[in-house]
Interface confidence: low
Amino acid sequence: EVEKTACPSGKKAREIDESLIFYKKWELEACVDAALLATQMDRVNAIPFTYEQLDVLKHKLDELYPQGYPESVIQHLGYLFLKMSPEDIRKWNVTSLETLKALLEVNKGHEMSPQVATLIDRFVKGRGQLDKDTLDTLTAFYPGYLCSLSPEELSSVPPSSIWAVRPQDLDTCDPRQLDVLYPKARLAFQNMNGSEYFVKIQSFLGGAPTEDLKALSQQNVSMDLATFMKLRTDAVLPLTVAEVQKLLGPHVEGLKAEERHRPVRDWILRQRQDDLDTLGLGLQGGIPNGYLVLDLSMQEALS
């Protein structure tokens, strides 16, 4: 905490300008008026203050706005935003997409910090849902944003917003998240024709159930291996060798390179070796001839 002392003669700030970088911390505390700082926040970003000096400026704003900063100040925080704690940000009411963009710009190129996560959470909750413009903005700054949301949070994404999602935005989504997003994408793209539909839905297929994969296998989609590897294991397991062959088309040869990885390794274990041999890829590990396959999950469901 900076000790309270009087401002030395001739040092009182009348403008927020570069002369302030030569002020000691206690001089900034004593000589800069908080209200002046608030009205000239847009200048702070252009001045090379030290981190310690920024701490003093933040302290002054905290004193002026103990209930949380107004949006007019928040929009111009610039690098001072990096000094905010999640607790500070929870007091804010950010409604403008421009304010959100301005603050995200400050953190650009870095991983999503707890501060940014809190800011986004406040903004989205204030809007009531993750609309297309917001999603566009967030995924532009953080391609992994969508995948940082819980399934519960994702449930508030309207199907119309799915059009803003790019394949790279889903790279780090886990199956539970894709389970929520896939039905929305299916709804959003339902009026597209076969090949266009597959291009759009492809990134979401990690949430697709078995029956949808079976349906796709009838449409000559030629799914690539990268997409296949992201499918839910439980959705892939019931697929027959013929269905997988149709689903992958010419890409079926790639199964060999992935035979040790999920879901391919688990799928192989469920197939008859005879059926696997029809692919001519040398896949090993299937059920040998003469073995009886019991569906234990069905047995459990009946008991």
Epitope: D174, H261, R262, L269, Q284, G285, G286, I287, P288
Partner: antibody
Framework: QVQLLQSGAEVKKPGASVKVSCKAS????????ISWVRQAPGQGLEWLGW????????NYAQKLQGRVTMTTDTSTSTSFMVLRSLRSDDTAVYYC???????????WGQGTMVTVSS | EIVMTQSPATLSLSPGERATLSCRTS???????LSWYQQKPGQAPRLLLY???TRATGIPARFSGSGSGTDFTLTISSLQPEDFAVYYC?????????FGGGTKVEIK
């Protein structure tokens, strides 16, 4: 109760082979796989491979490919690991573990100390 | 292969304190494929959590897990004397399965 009981400690010379056994009890052996993990003295855990009991499908760590063989005998609910061409850096405690829910290793054997020394 | 990096290497805490152990993966790992193990001297490892946050049978509620992508955390809310041990994270998303180097939680 569910448990895995491993064979006793072994002292081997470089170039020799060792066979470690792991006897399962308390559960249906063929329902689960068995994984093998080793731990050199004072070091962390290293996965060696696993075997699926019902169809004997194996996956080995690339590092040991060609030197390790994992087998099972379903009649005695026992899994075996053979490591050939032993070197001094193979000195470690060798553990077998049941590959349970979510492929996590939910039950572990007590470990078998294998010492390779000339 | 996926490299697992645990930090800190050693955590010195007193009984009753909260322990937070970190595990970072070199590639993104789906939550379903991350487990945590506890190992005490002279004993075999014991499964604590699988699927990032699901407690194994018999594991007390003070153990919890979180994280996604490449960053995962094991939290022990209030350390008990029997919790002082080495903790390992492990992924089984891609072969070879790999373990972290371990975090030793020792009595301060």
């Amino acid at each position: 109760q569910v448990q895995l009981l491993q064979s006793g400690a072994e002292v081997k010379k470089p170039g020799a082979s060792v066979k470690v056994s792991c006897k399962a009890s308390g559960y249906t052996f063929t329902t689960y796989g068995i994984s093998w993990v080793r731990q050199a003295p004072g070091q962390g855990l290293e996965w060696l491979g696993w075997i699926t009991a019902y169809n004997r499908n194996t996956n080995y760590a690339q590092k040991l490919q060609g030197r390790v063989t994992m087998t099972t005998d379903t009649s005695t609910s026992t899994s075996f690991m053979v490591l050939r061409s032993l070197r001094s850096d193979d000195t470690a405690v060798y553990y077998c573990a049941r590959v349970g829910d979510s492929d996590a290793f939910d039950i572990w054997g007590q470990g078998t100390m294998v010492t390779v020394s000339s | 292969e996926i490299v697992m990096t645990q930090s800190p290497a050693t955590l010195s805490l007193s009984p009753g304190e909260r322990a937070t152990l970190s595990c970072r993966t070199s590639q993104s790992v789906f939550n379903s494929f991350l487990s945590w193990y506890q190992q005490k001297p002279g004993q075999a490892p014991r499964l604590l959590l699988y699927g990032t946050s699901t407690r194994a049978t018999g594991i007390p509620a003070r153990f919890s897990g979180s994280g996604s992508g490449t960053d995962f955390t094991l939290t022990i809310s209030s350390l008990q004397p029997e919790d002082f041990a080495v903790y390992y994270c492990q992924q089984d998303y891609k072969l070879p399965l790999t373990f972290g180097g371990g975090t030793k939680v020792e009595i301060k």
